[in-house]
């Protein structure tokens, strides 16, 4: 912590400008009052301070505003946001985007960092909800947003901000948290016709049952392998060698270079040999013909 | 609830064939939900896939051990056997049976046997 | 083969402590990846499965997550019992483990 000393004669400063790059810390600390400071944050982000100035201004806002900053200083925070920890930002009550967005602007490029996460928690539970408008910007500054969400988090997502997400979006997603964007996303897209349908479905179907699977087989939709590899395990596996042909339509050739791989391989291994080889795709290891095919799964959670 | 038990020889001669059964009880190997597989681990290292059965008889092995794997499975006794020819020094491990749940993973595991390739 | 580089190989780590695993597959291997626990003289114990999914009887203090082609297993506040080797697997392809992560008491 800087010591208290009495700032020198006609070094008090009356505004925030770029003489105050040549103040040593304890003239900082000495010579420029905190509410300036406040009135004039916009100014701090266009003077090349160094990190230890920017400690000394962080320690007059926090002697200033010990509650936590008012956001009209929280907006032209700039570079010295760098600066706040966890801690202090948990202290703020962020309320308008375009904040969100100054402060996200400030660490753009670099990967979401402990203060970043904070911040948009607050701001995300200051809202209620994850909102179309929010969605948009925190995707566009961190494409991997959704996916860092838990599954509980993401059930606040009102399924009118699926709008918003890109495939790229949901690269990084697991399993359970495609179970609760799928239902969001089918609800969102529902009015649209069967091929823009498929479209926008597409990057969610991660989290597809086999029920919507067989139904989209019906439509002509030609899945491509790389979505089909992204299918639920347990989706996939229900599906007949009928069903399959139907969903990849020209893409089924795809399926022999995917056969050593999941959840191609646990799928061949169900299928019929007969039924395999109806595809002509030279596909191996299905059930031989004459035998017995059985499913003792649900007897053996039940004994 | 499904128990799985390793059972062979302890001591195999270089060049000799390793051979080990699993035993299955308190379920059923004709179960499409799993595959029956054999995994080692040497001393004070890490864990290798050898390689696993469906139980209409597909296998899938290790590429650098396919050439001397077999691993078959006998419905009828609820066991899966694994044998490992022309072994050496270097294939003393602890041999483990296991349950692989397509939906999950490795999920019931033998207690594991140990196997020393010593002349 | 897909190869899974796991890190560290050892960490020293008191009760009450945050641990963190990683594991990184040389290929996309979607959410294929499960964790083990090992103790001494043991077999091992499924934790996680499709990367972040918790095992049955398995303690939420222990949770998997992914990023592409890097898993992470985190034990949010480690307990006595939690001191072990730990294991990544895919299981895209044939199946393949990390190296291990020794769990010591600091």
């Known amino acids: 912590e800087v010591e208290k000393t009495a700032c020198p004669s006609g070094k008090k400063a009356r505004e925030i400008d770029e003489s105050l790059i040549f103040y040593k810390k304890w003239e900082l600390e000495a010579c420029v009052d905190a509410a300036l400071l406040a009135t004039q944050m916009d100014r701090v982000n266009a003077i090349p301070f160094t990190y230890e100035q920017l400690d000394v201004l962080k320690h007059k806002l926090d002697e200033l505003y010990p509650q936590g900053y008012p956001e009209s200083v929280i907006q032209h925070l700039g570079y010295l946001f760098l600066k706040m920890s966890p801690e202090d930002i948990r202290k703020w009550n962020v309320t308008s985007l375009e904040t969100l967005k100054a402060l996200l602007e400030v660490n753009k490029g670099h990967e979401m960092s402990p203060q970043v996460a904070t911040l948009i928690d607050r701001f995300v539970k200051g809202r209620g909800q994850l909102d179309k408008d929010t969605l948009d910007t925190l995707t566009a500054f961190y494409p991997g947003y959704l996916c860092s969400l838990s599954p509980e988090e993401l059930s606040s997502v009102p399924p009118s901000s699926i709008w918003a997400v890109r495939p790229q979006d949901l690269d990084t997603c697991d399993p359970r948290q495609l179970d609760v964007l799928y239902p969001k996303a089918r609800l969102a897209f529902q009015n649209m016709n069967g091929s823009e349908y498929f479209v926008k479905i597409q990057s969610f179907l991660g989290g597809a049952p086999t029920e919507d699977l067989k139904a989209l087989s019906q439509q002509n939709v030609s899945m491509d392998l790389a979505t089909f590899m992204k299918l639920r395990t347990d989706a996939v596996l229900p599906l007949t060698v009928a069903e399959v042909q139907k969903l990849l339509g020209p893409h089924v050739e795809g399926l022999k270079a995917e056969e050593r791989h999941r959840p191609v391989r646990d799928w061949i291994l169900r299928q019929r040999q007969d039924d395999l080889d109806t595809l002509g795709l030279g596909l191996q290891g299905g059930i031989p013909n004459g035998y017995l095919v059985l499913d003792l799964s649900m007897q053996e959670a039940l004994s | 609830q499904v128990q799985l038990q390793e059972s062979g020889p302890g001591l195999v001669k270089p060049s000799q064939t390793l051979s080990l059964t699993c035993t299955v009880s308190?379920?059923?190997?004709?179960?499409?939900?799993?595959?029956w597989t054999w995994i080692r681990q040497h001393p004070g290292k890490g864990l290798e896939w050898i390689g696993y059965?469906?139980?209409?008889?597909?296998?899938f092995y290790n590429p650098s051990l396919k050439s001397r794997v077999t691993i078959s499975v006998d419905t009828s006794k609820t066991q899966f056997s694994l044998k490992l020819s022309s072994v050496t020094a270097a294939d003393t491990a602890v041999y483990y049976c296991?349950?692989?749940?397509?939906?999950?993973?490795?999920?019931?595991w033998g207690q594991g046997t140990t196997v020393t390739v010593s002349s | 083969d897909i190869q899974m580089t796991q890190s560290p190989s050892s960490l020293s780590a008191s009760v009450g402590d945050r641990v963190t695993i990683t594991c990184r597959a040389s290929?996309?291997?979607?959410?294929?990846l499960n964790w083990y626990q090992q103790k001494p003289g043991k077999a091992p114990t499924l934790l996680i499965y499709?990367?972040?999914s918790l095992q049955s009887g398995v303690p939420s203090r222990f949770s998997g997550s992914r990023s592409g082609t890097d898993f992470t297993l985190t034990i949010s506040s480690l307990q006595p019992e939690d001191f072990a080797a730990y294991f990544c697997?895919?299981?895209?392809?044939?199946?393949?483990f990390g190296q291990g992560t020794k769990v010591e008491v600091k």
């Open positions: 296991a349950r692989e749940d397509t939906m999950t993973g490795l999920d019931v």
């Open positions: 308190g379920g059923s190997i004709n179960n499409n939900n799993y595959y």
């Open positions: 059965i469906y139980y209409s008889g597909s296998t």
């Open positions: 290929q996309s291997i979607n959410n294929y």
């Open positions: 499709a990367a972040s």
């Open positions: 697997q895919q299981t895209y392809s044939n199946p393949t």
